[in-house]
C-alpha cells in the first residue's frame, strides 16, 4: 500500500485526514476519561483540546458508555490484569493484529482496540511509565491509519459508530466486543 496521499483530502467525514484527526481526538478523550475515573492524572495527554462539536461529543459519549460496560466484564478485566507490561510493544502488536486477523472489520473491534490501548495506558500510569502513554497512542493511531482507515472510509466515517452502537441492543454488541478482546488476549497468553 502506498500511503502518500492519494486518499481524498479536505474536511469531508471520509477523508483520511479527518478520520485520523477524529480518531486521535476520540482516543485521547477516551483515555483521559478512563484515567480521570481512576483518579489518575495524565498531563502527557493534554496535547490538543478535544473539540466540542456535537458529532464528536456524541461519539465520545458512545465510547464512554461502552467503556463503562467493558469495565464491568470481570473475565476481560482478569485477562487485562495479567498482561505483562514489560514488553508492551509485543503485546500491543500481537493482540491488535489478532483482533483483525480474520479480515473481518466492525465497529466493535475498533472500540476493542481503543479500549485495549486505554488499559495499557492506565497500566503505564500505574507503573509510573508516563513516556509509554504517547507511544501507545502512537501505536494505536498507526494501526488505525494502516489497517482500519480504508474500512472506516467505507462506513462513511466515524458516524457509522453511532448507528452501530445506537441500537437498543448495544449491550449485546458490547458483550461481543469483550469476547473479541478476551479471545485475542487468550491467544496472546498461549503464544507468550
Amino acid at each position: 500500500m502506498d500511503g502518500s496521499g492519494e486518499q481524498p483530502r479536505g474536511g469531508g467525514p471520509t477523508s483520511s485526514e479527518q478520520i485520523m484527526k477524529t480518531g486521535a481526538l476520540l482516543l485521547q478523550g477516551f483515555i483521559q476519561d478512563r484515567a480521570g475515573r481512576m483518579g489518575g492524572e495524565a498531563p502527557e495527554l493534554a496535547l490538543d483540546p478535544v473539540p466540542q462539536d456535537a458529532s464528536t461529543k456524541k461519539l465520545s459519549e458512545c465510547l464512554k458508555r461502552i467503556g463503562d460496560e467493558l469495565d464491568s466484564n470481570m473475565e476481560l478485566q482478569r485477562m487485562i490484569a495479567a498482561v505483562d507490561t514489560d514488553s508492551p510493544r509485543e503485546v500491543f502488536f500481537r493482540v491488535a493484529a489478532d483482533m483483525f486477523s480474520d479480515g473481518n472489520f466492525n465497529w466493535g473491534r475498533v472500540v476493542a482496540l481503543f479500549y485495549f490501548a486505554s488499559k495499557l495506558v492506565l497500566k503505564a500510569l500505574c507503573t509510573k511509565v508516563p513516556e509509554l502513554i504517547r507511544t501507545i497512542m502512537g501505536w494505536t493511531l498507526d494501526f488505525l491509519r494502516e489497517r482500519l482507515l480504508g474500512w472506516i472510509q467505507d462506513q462513511g466515517g466515524w458516524d457509522g459508530l453511532l448507528s452501530y452502537f445506537g441500537t437498543p441492543t448495544w449491550q449485546t454488541v458490547t458483550i461481543f466486543v469483550a469476547g473479541v478482546l478476551t479471545a485475542s488476549l487468550t491467544i496472546w497468553k498461549k503464544m507468550g
Partner: antibody, heavy 125, light 107 residues
Framework: EVQLVESGGGLVQPGGSLRLSCAAS????????IHWVRQAPGKGLEWVAS????????YYADSVKGRFTISADTSKNTAYLQMNSLRAEDTAVYYC??????????????????WGQGTLVTVSS | DIQMTQSPSSLSASVGDRVTITCRAS??????VAWYQQKPGKAPKLLIY???SLYSGVPSRFSGSRSGTDFTLTISSLQPEDFATYYC?????????FGQGTKVEIK
C-alpha cells in the same frame, strides 16, 4: 546495542541502478518503520521512502515514486532501497533511520531515533 | 505537501547564549514534529520528538515547544559542542518533510 549500517552506495551512470542495504541489529525491524532519508551535497535533508513490514506497507516521496522500491527481509533484519533510472539529482548521502510510531496522520511522533552512518550515491557520466 | 519554514537559516552566537530556532508548518501538523542536530559528515541526531519531548540522553538545555503551527527549539545555554545545523521535521501528513535547516555558528 541498536545499530543501522548502510551499504551499496557508489558511482553510477545516469539511467543506471543501485541497491542500498540497511542492516539492523539490536532490534527487530518488523516492529518499526524503516525510513530512507537523503542529503545532497551541501543541502538539507529529504525524506525518500519508508516501510513497515508489520503492516506490509510502503511509502514514497513523489520525486522517487516509480523509480525506487523499498523492501525488507525480516529474516535478515535488513531493509533495502532499489534505485532504478537514476538521475544526477539523486546524488546524495543516503541514510536509513527507524521510527517507532507516527508515520502520517498521527498526532504524536517518536521521531527518527537511530540513524545509520550514511552511504554516498553519485550519479554522473 | 506541508512546508516547514525554518528560521533563521543561520545564526552566530557565543557560548552561554540562549538560542531560539523556529519552524512554521504551512498547515496543522498536531504535535508530530521532531528536531534534529547534524554535524558535518555525520548522521542527524534526534533531540526532540512530539514537539516537546526530550529524547533520552539529550542534555536538558535543549527544549521544544509548540504554539499552533509554530514550533520552537531552544538551547538555554549554548555549549561548544552545540555548534551544528538543526532541522525540524513533521510526520503528520505524507510526505514527511523537513525544514531547510539552521546553521548555528560561533560568533
Amino acid at each position: 546495542e541498536v545499530q543501522l549500517v548502510e551499504s551499496g552506495g557508489g558511482l553510477v551512470q545516469p539511467g543506471g541502478s543501485l541497491r542500498l542495504s540497511c542492516a539492523a541489529s539490536g532490534f527487530n525491524i518488523s516492529s518499526y518503520y524503516i525510513h530512507w532519508v537523503r542529503q545532497a551535497p551541501g543541502k538539507g535533508l529529504e525524506w525518500v521512502a519508508s516501510i513497515s513490514s508489520y503492516y506490509s506497507s510502503t511509502y514514497y516521496a513523489d520525486s522517487v515514486k516509480g523509480r525506487f522500491t523499498i523492501s525488507a527481509d525480516t529474516s535478515k533484519n535488513t531493509a533495502y532501497l532499489q534505485m532504478n533510472s537514476l538521475r544526477a539529482e539523486d546524488t546524495a548521502v543516503y541514510y536509513c533511520a527507524r521510527v517507532s510510531y507516527g508515520h502520517a496522520y498521527v498526532g504524536y511522533s517518536s521521531g527518527m531515533d537511530y540513524w545509520g552512518q550514511g552511504t554516498l550515491v553519485t550519479v554522473s557520466s | 505537501d506541508i512546508q516547514m519554514t525554518q528560521s533563521p537559516s543561520s545564526l552566530s552566537a557565543s557560548v552561554g547564549d540562549r538560542v531560539t530556532i523556529t519552524c512554521r508548518a504551512s498547515q496543522s501538523v498536531s504535535s508530530a514534529v521532531a528536531w534534529y542536530q547534524q554535524k558535518p559528515g555525520k548522521a542527524p541526531k534526534l533531540l526532540i520528538y512530539s514537539a516537546s519531548s526530550l529524547y533520552s540522553g539529550v542534555p536538558s538545555r535543549f527544549s521544544g515547544s509548540r504554539s499552533g503551527t509554530d514550533f520552537t527549539l531552544t538551547i538555554s545555554s549554548l555549549q561548544p559542542e552545540d555548534f551544528a545545523t538543526y532541522y525540524c521535521q513533521q510526520s503528520y501528513v505524507s510526505p514527511i518533510t523537513f525544514g531547510q535547516g539552521t546553521k548555528v555558528e560561533i560568533k
